[in-house]
């Protein structure tokens, strides 16, 4: 017996071919022997079975002995063993209609599980593989469950039912909601204007809900909410930000922050969370703000740096054109009666530099002795 | 453990309607297919009906077509049975069953494992 | 449907002797079998399926074999908790139907 996978909505033919190719005499009927179509003279009757509005046959075939029968829209229950009577000979095609669904939104938000469900009908054994856009695989019964949805599986994810050793292949388009990006870091010497932005990693016709921006600088010892917006179709609007400091938002997405100064004060880490319409749980984008100072003050030349940073990173101070170099993974480096000229900070990680900060020694003459 | 309860049987007359309930628990509900199994008094046993996890996909045998109507929540781990136009012959113990599987290598063999302890219709007049 | 036919309807065999239970089907099922065990007032209990694995925690004495249209369950010691009421059971085409049953009795 000839077996046929089928998907849920799609369309199926069934093939028969008598040995004489030419038109003769054919009948499709189902398992309880109740004919669905056939041949009477030359035109296509239908039998009293369910089928009848969505099965038909290719006429133009039947004078090549192919006597098919085509099922528009296929549903689970289609799922039969059907038979073709021609030339006093029976040819048995069992059909298996399969569907596959995700069990909720197929717009998730990063973190949540994903359970995509087979619909099957009884007596069939099916297994379930499916392939995610950044090529994890996963496989299973008539249930597939990914526990945790990351970034990268965003896309079209593709499955293959297997069947009595055919296959039948599913596209689902599953939308990860996330920001671009888990963690950013600005770096940003003292008094330059800081750009926070948060691109989103996917995109909706509508797009509404709330966010806010927690703060925690290292030199406080709680965090505070720096911005609370409103997000109504892609529009932004501000609802409460604090006065120290004065944040400026963009209207439009993506979500875009503005810091006037960079401050020492200022340096730390923030916590940006939004809240979508009809989405249980918070998307999430850590920032963090590096600040740089460089001063001198008497015979001292400081290089200062306040943030979140690793102890991997190199901080030195660096004097231009000459070797003089004082570098130290640390979050201050000094230099003490320093000669004269332009002066560099340097804060870099496995010498790629994230971050300078020039500053000009001039010569000190000797106070002259009064006599 | 894994728990399957059944209630709402009951003396019904013909003619009349049950509602039977299937009460889950020790396993994740919603990745099961489930189904109703019936046997009459001193008879042998009968396949009711079928319903995917989803509740989606439905199956009934002939006998029960059209009368009985066979839904499941997820959220409260319950599968049921609407009985309408009951007959005399309807009468029997109503189990729930789960559909389970196991797996080797590639291949997936259905069966079902797990069944209720049943409850009782009886429709007499 | 496809119709199971159990036989013999009834057998008797004595504790500690082999038992041999038989089941056609109208038509190939392939490995798509079950046996179950019933006891009075109990719900069936799942021995075997896909014709010959044995279901969780079921002894080893209980083993299934055939395929297609032929099916046996075979008691290699009959245990005195043994004497029930066996079906077979085909879940190859819906509707899933079951054999009458055959009643296994202590000689």
């Known amino acids: 017996k000839k077996v046929v996978l089928g998907k849920k909505g799609d369309t199926v033919e069934l093939t028969c071919n008598a040995s004489q190719k030419k038109n003769t005499q054919f009948h499709w009927k189902n398992s309880n022997q109740i004919k669905i179509l056939g041949i009477q003279g030359l035109f296509l009757t239908k039998g009293p079975s369910k089928l009848s509005d969505r099965a038909d046959s290719r006429k133009s075939l039947w004078d090549q002995g192919c006597f098919s029968m085509i099922i528009k829209n296929l549903k689970i229950e289609d799922s039969d063993t059907y038979i073709c009577e021609v030339e006093n000979k029976k040819e048995e095609v069992e059909l298996l209609v399969f569907g596959l669904t995700a069990n909720s939104d197929t717009h998730l938000l990063e973190g949540q599980s994903l359970t995509l469900t087979l619909e099957s009908p009884p007596g069939s054994s099916p297994s379930v593989k499916c392939r995610s856009p950044g090529g994890k695989n996963i496989q299973g019964g008539r249930t597939i469950s990914v526990p945790q949805l990351e970034r990268q599986d965003s896309g079209t994810w593709t499955c293959t039912v297997s069947q009595d050793q055919k296959t039948v292949e599913f596209k689902i388009d599953i939308v990860v909601l996330a920001f671009q990006k888990a963690s950013s870091t600005v770096y940003k010497k003292e008094g330059e204007q800081v750009e926070f932005s948060f691109p989103l990693a996917f995109t909706l016709e509508k797009l509404t809900g709330s966010g806010e921006l927690w703060w925690q600088a290292e030199r406080a010892s709680s965090s505070k909410s720096w911005i609370t917006f409103d997000l109504k179709n892609k529009e932004v609007s501000v609802k409460r930000v604090t006065q120290d400091p004065k944040l400026q938002m963009g209207k439009k997405l993506p979500l875009h922050l503005t810091l006037p100064q960079a401050l020492p004060q200022y340096a730390g880490s923030g916590n940006l969370t939004l809240a979508l319409e009809a989405k249980t749980g918070k998307l999430h984008q850590e920032v963090n703000l590096v600040v740089m100072r460089a001063t001198q003050f008497q015979e001292n030349l400081t290089c200062e740096v306040w943030g979140p940073t690793s102890p991997k990173l190199t901080l030195s101070l660096k004097l231009e054109n000459k070797g003089a170099t004082v570098s130290k993974q640390a979050k201050a480096v000094w230099v003490l009666n320093p000669e004269a000229g332009m002066w560099q900070c340097l804060l870099s990680d496995s010498g790629q530099v994230l971050l300078e900060s020039n500053i000009k020694v001039v010569p000190t003459w000797p106070t002259p002795v009064q006599p | 453990q894994v728990q399957l309860v059944e209630s709402g049987g009951g003396l019904v007359k013909p003619g009349g309607s049950l509602r039977l309930s299937c009460a889950a628990s020790g396993f994740t509900f919603s990745d099961y297919y489930m189904n109703w199994i019936r046997q009459a008094p001193g008879k042998g046993l009968e396949w009711v009906s079928y319903?995917?996890?989803?509740?989606?996909?439905?199956f009934y045998t002939d006998s029960v077509k059209g009368r009985f109507t066979i839904s499941r929540d997820n959220a409260k781990n319950s599968l049921f049975l609407q009985m309408n136009s009951l007959r005399a012959e309807d009468t029997a113990v109503y189990y729930c069953?789960?559909?389970?599987?196991?797996?080797?290598?590639?291949?997936?063999?259905?069966?079902?494992?797990?069944w209720g302890k049943g409850t009782t219709v009886t429709v007499s007049s | 449907e496809i119709v199971m036919t159990q036989s013999p309807a009834a057998l008797s065999v004595s504790p500690g002797e082999r038992a041999t239970l038989s089941c056609r089907a109208s038509q190939s099922v392939s490995s798509k079998f079950a046996w179950y065990q019933q006891k009075p007032g109990q719900a069936p209990r799942l021995l075997i399926y896909?014709?010959?694995t044995r279901a969780t925690g079921i002894p080893a004495r209980f083993s299934g074999s055939g395929s297609g249209t032929e099916f046996t369950l075979t008691i290699s010691s009959l245990q005195s908790e043994d004497f029930a009421v066996y079906y077979c059971?085909?879940?190859?085409?819906?509707?899933?139907?079951f054999g009458q049953g055959t009643k296994l009795e202590i000689k």
């Open positions: 059971h085909q879940y190859k085409n819906w509707p899933y139907t």
């Open positions: 896909n014709a010959s």
């Open positions: 069953a789960r559909e389970d599987y196991s797996n080797y290598e590639d291949y997936y063999y259905y069966y079902t494992g797990v």
């Open positions: 319903i995917s996890s989803s509740g989606k996909t439905i």
